[in-house]
């Protein structure tokens, strides 16, 4: 097996990802590892040269750059955190911060917009991941209420008075909790929504 | 370490425009978003917008987008802002600070402050 | 857009004193908070990051704490030194400065 550089009339290359033509001298060479730029052009008698990205620099895969690519930081302006540093192999990661989804993608997250409430008697229906999109409202199943706006309050079981030695004075709706009173106690006229005791 | 020149002042009169500069010693430009704060005569800070260096991409409050442009040169590790139009109230003190890799969630390093007169 | 607002917009003690400045957000922040310190005629200088987190070469007497929308910057014991404007600033969903406390000493 040839070993680079080496003659190819086809201009393609045996292994794509670590070998690339040359069109000038009508030569496979080999590309940079991860983490590595070209220091040195390959010829018909020399390989690649290559070479270690600098600090805060990187390439993150085999390539035949003669520059690394400049490490970014996450930009907090678009929404953004940090979730990995940059190394010379790999970009900076960054995420959407807590509260906010992914509203502009190009190949990464590029912005983030923070989620919609979910209004009374909703709330989020849960996504695979986290950050990917917009909140999307669901009611409250039966036997369950919300009672804020907000894009992250989930949806609570009402309160089983019974559980408490009280009965029900009110019962729950999707966005308020069951009214429990005291057995013994009448209910007076100004009740609402709370627990009498 | 990382440090940042701005010049002291700069006289300006209404209608016209003057460009502000700020110089990065120490450490990449390419590797950080440049910020410009505003201070006005005896009240706080206000965010102005940011530059990213490596492809001139800029973000600036509302307030701000018909006043100030943002600028930068790698090759000379400088920011620049430039501002329009001046008024009376553009009368401040405007400060250049960088997010950087180790710092991208606030501004460890301050230029100076240039302050900008607008007087006739 | 979410609001910063700082309490006591202006503050005299004595040294010695603790002293807790104010800053609350009109939503939550999730902690993303830095305080700065600003005295007549410099630039700004960070005190604490991420709430709680100390700037290297700021005096042990600083502290930060807080969640959601209500943050507090602590002085334990207050030196002549700290007389400054402190200023709180959020980078949730970018960049947003408070009013400003402006701490004199008696």
């Known amino acids: 097996q040839a070993v680079p550089p080496y003659a190819s009339e086809n201009q393609t290359c045996r292994d794509q990802e670590k070998e690339y033509y040359e069109p000038q001298h009508r030569i496979c060479c080999s590309r940079c590892p991860p983490g590595t730029y070209v220091s040195a052009k390959c010829s018909r008698i020399r390989d690649t040269v290559c070479a270690t990205c600098a600090e805060n620099s990187y390439n993150e895969h085999w390539n035949y750059l003669t520059i690394c690519q400049l490490c970014r930081p996450c930009d907090p302006v678009m929404g953004l955190e940090e979730i990995a540093p940059c190394t010379s192999k790999r970009k900076t990661q960054c995420r959407c911060q807590p509260g906010m989804f992914c509203a502009a993608w190009a190949l990464e997250c590029t912005h983030c917009e923070l989620l919609s409430d979910c209004p009374p008697g909703t709330e989020a229906e849960l996504k695979d991941e986290v950050g990917k999109g917009n909140n999307h409202c669901v009611p409250c199943k039966a036997g369950h209420f919300q009672n804020t706006s907000s894009p992250s309050a989930r949806c609570q079981p009402h309160t089983r008075c019974e559980n408490q030695g009280l009965v029900e004075a009110a019962p729950g709706t999707a966005q308020s909790d069951t009214t429990c009173k005291n057995p013994l106690e009448p209910l007076p006229p100004e009740m609402s929504g709370t627990m009498l005791m | 370490e990382v440090q940042l020149q701005q010049y002291g002042a700069e006289l300006g009169k209404p209608g016209t425009s003057v460009k502000l500069s700020c110089k990065v010693s120490?450490?990449?430009?390419?590797?950080?978003?440049i910020h410009w704060v505003i201070q006005r005569p005896g009240k706080g800070l206000e965010w102005i917008g940011r530059?990213?260096?490596?492809?001139?991409?800029?973000i600036s409050t509302e307030k701000f987008k018909n006043k100030a442009t943002l600028t930068a040169d790698l090759s000379s590790n400088t920011a620049y802002m430039q501002l329009s139009q001046l008024k009376s109230d553009d009368t401040a003190i405007y400060f250049c600070?960088?997010?950087?890799?180790?710092?991208?969630?606030?501004?460890?390093?301050w230029g100076q402050g240039t302050l900008v007169t607008v007087s006739s | 857009d979410i609001q910063m607002t700082q309490s006591p917009s202006q503050l005299s003690a004595s040294v010695g004193d603790r002293v807790t400045l104010s800053c609350k957000a009109s939503?939550?922040?999730?902690?993303?908070l830095n305080w700065y310190q600003q005295k007549l005629g410099e630039a700004p200088r960070l005190l604490i990051y991420?709430?709680?987190i100390l700037q290297t070469g700021i005096p042990s007497r600083f502290s930060g704490s807080g969640s959601g929308t209500d943050y507090t910057l602590t002085i334990s014991s207050l030196q002549p030194e700290d007389a400054a404007t402190y200023f709180c600033?959020?980078?949730?969903?970018?960049?947003?400065f408070g009013s400003g406390t402006k701490l004199e000493m008696k």
């Open positions: 991420s709430t709680n």
């Open positions: 120490g450490y990449n430009i390419g590797n950080t978003y």
């Open positions: 530059i990213d260096p490596t492809n001139g991409n800029t």
């Open positions: 939503q939550n922040i999730y902690k993303y």
């Open positions: 600070a960088p997010t950087t890799l180790t710092t991208p969630d606030s501004f460890a390093y």
């Open positions: 600033q959020k980078y949730y969903s970018g960049f947003t």
